[in-house]
Amino acid sequence: SEVGNSQAVCAGTLNGLSVTGDAQHQYRTLHKMYNNCEIVMGNLEIVLIDHTQDLSFLQTIREVTGYILIAMNVFSTLPLRNLRVIRGTQFYEEKYALFVLLNYNPNATHALRQLGLNRLTEILAGGVYIEKNEQLCHVDTVEWRDIMRDPRLEPVVGDNGRACAPCHESCGGHCWGPGPEDCQQLTKTICAPQCNGRCFGRAPNECCHEECAGGCTGPLQTHCFACRHFNDSGACVPLCPQPLIYNKLTFQLEPNPDTKYQYGSVCVRSCPHNFVVDQSSCVRACPSNKMEVEKNGLKMCEPCAGLCPKACEGTGAGSHYQTVDSSNIDSFVNCTKILGNLDFLITGLEGDPWRNISALDPEKLNVFRTVREITGYLNIQSWPKHMHNFSVFSNLETIGGRSLYNRGFSLLIMKNDNVTSLGLRSLREVSAGRVYITENRRLCYLHTVQWAALSRRRADLDIRNNKPRGKCQQEGKVCDPLCSADGCWGPGPAQCLSCRHYSRRGVCVESCSFTQGETREFAEGTECFECHPECERVEGGITCNGSGADTCTRCAHYRDGPHCVERCPEGILGERGPIYKYPDSSRECRPCHENCTRGCTGPLLQDCLGDALPSARRAPTVI
């Protein structure tokens, strides 16, 4: 088999025609990157290399995932004689997977004379550009259409060597050089019409397996020169063994003990140490909506619940800024944790013309909606006139008090004349420090808050000269009746510290939608949660008793074992192959006949969709 098991992988480059240092430095860099390399993950760029350099170390390369750029070099031949595949996952100049340009020295005889890509039989994506290589021969004798998978692309080949020897007579007019060993191996244009990919001969039974790339030595997926998709221990497969497989006993997808991860075009049991697992791939870094976690010693990307954690430097002591202002507000975008403090001073809100800082656009304060934790203190001495609460901090859960303001304060709110309620609806802990809330002339509701419940130690409060409690009550500025006795941060059922009855997504309600309403719910403690979308709504009765698809009273679509499902399993990977089921008259999922390969409408062999396997052949697993 040409498809090996373990392969030396190296990173490519993305420099284009830019180079750093002299020719010697270029060569050393190239040698360091590609010595003993078999698969280039990225682009192979060979630019400005001298004729004196020994490039024989490149002959180990069998595959390049991106593009190949050969430009402005003066060596005579390119020792990529074992290169089989260019995948073209990235293009040069937006459409080329192989780009060869200006490889000659106008003042000397040194030039590229032969490509030497004798084993190149597949370019999976992208085109070919070979121009202005004054002495380069045997590029127009290559049948590029046999190599390029995309039939719509025209190779751009011209203005290269003119005085070239013909192909050897044994080559049939297609070659990489003048000798009999330079004949081009055709693996596509010579195939019988029955072959839908490549072939190893002209006969109808000499087709390569459809997972092969570049050709093969025989019909099996282990006979490929290279893999179209992934190489799994020497076999070419459309997907690496997936992380989840269907368990026919539990009717659920469960972790696959034999899972492998995609590392480029190779299936590996574990990712290289500097990579993390994202679903079933090895990636350098998690995407922006996921965060890196370690599970059983495995570094994985997990979707963040809401925004991914992002820690940002605050203001005040030990920081670059004294206050939040128009010059720094944008640095708080998507922050979930403030390392330090937040200070809101009049110079920040109104601006400081002497320091060329404009007034703060009050709308921009909404950036703080993502903040869940402040490790130091929160100090609000100035607030926009039209904003009557601090609801931009409605997701703030913890004030750490690791650094304190003035006489030991971790929460200080003073002289904000227009503020009528605090609106800190998620605040559940003031870990250390004192609370100072004074001289906010219109501020109500704060007397209702059980501050002792927020503080780890005895609450040390300095709360005075706000609107008198009696006046607030007279004006009806009291907690919503759905709030418990713990108090509230402001008006309405969304501002309660806790609820008298039930809560739904942070809002207090009389009751959950157990038996009526558009969306049905169940309760966990006093919290209402929606039933699984696969549960059928039961009129006048309980729709579900938990969150899973196995807690429904009735199914909206089909039932597979205890689980309500949108459709019965169709080709889901099981322990021993794909699994197919059909729904019976009572909408229960039942297994297809064991020889069905594309699903079925009933349990019998004649109910199979598409072709069934002949009885003698190994069938996919069904249950």
Epitope: A317, Q322, T323, D343, L345, I346, T347, G348, E350, D352, P353, W354, R355, N379, Q381, S382, N406, R407, M414, K415, Y436, T438, E439, D462, R464, N465
Partner: nanobody
């Protein structure tokens, strides 16, 4: 360039009075709490009085309560410290300072919370 310039210091007999002025430039005076500090030879700098930027709330150290009065004129970008019934122990270099942090009840603006400082003016109370 930010500047705070103190004036009005001098030699005065015990029981006498002085009025210190602090003229500010280079920043938005109205937004800043103004504080007066003093430092006697061989002693640490101590807070004497401060006045809020917004509502004129003022703070006085126990040692000067009833004798000193702080005021400000935002139109003139100037703060004042009227010192009556002066005592020999009031002898010190008096500094004015400006803080973007506001002063409030029960707060005392500490030395490190002031952004800008003047050079100081000498007050000597002696017979």
């Amino acid at each position: 360039e930010v500047q705070l310039v103190e004036s009005g210091g001098g030699l005065v007999q015990p029981g006498g009075s002085l009025r210190l002025s602090c003229a500010a430039s280079g920043f938005t005076f109205d937004y800043y709490t103004i504080g007066w500090f003093r430092q006697a030879p061989g002693k640490e700098r101590e807070g004497v009085s401060c006045i809020s930027s917004r509502d004129g709330d003022s703070y006085y150290a126990d040692s000067v309560k009833g004798r000193f009065t702080i005021s400000r004129d935002n139109a003139k970008n100037t703060a004042y410290l009227q010192m009556n019934s002066l005592k020999p122990e009031d002898t010190a270099v008096y500094y004015c300072a400006a803080s973007a942090s506001d002063y409030g009840l029960g707060l005392e603006l500490f030395h490190d919370e002031y952004n800008y400082w003047g050079q100081g003016t000498q007050v000597t109370v002696s017979s």
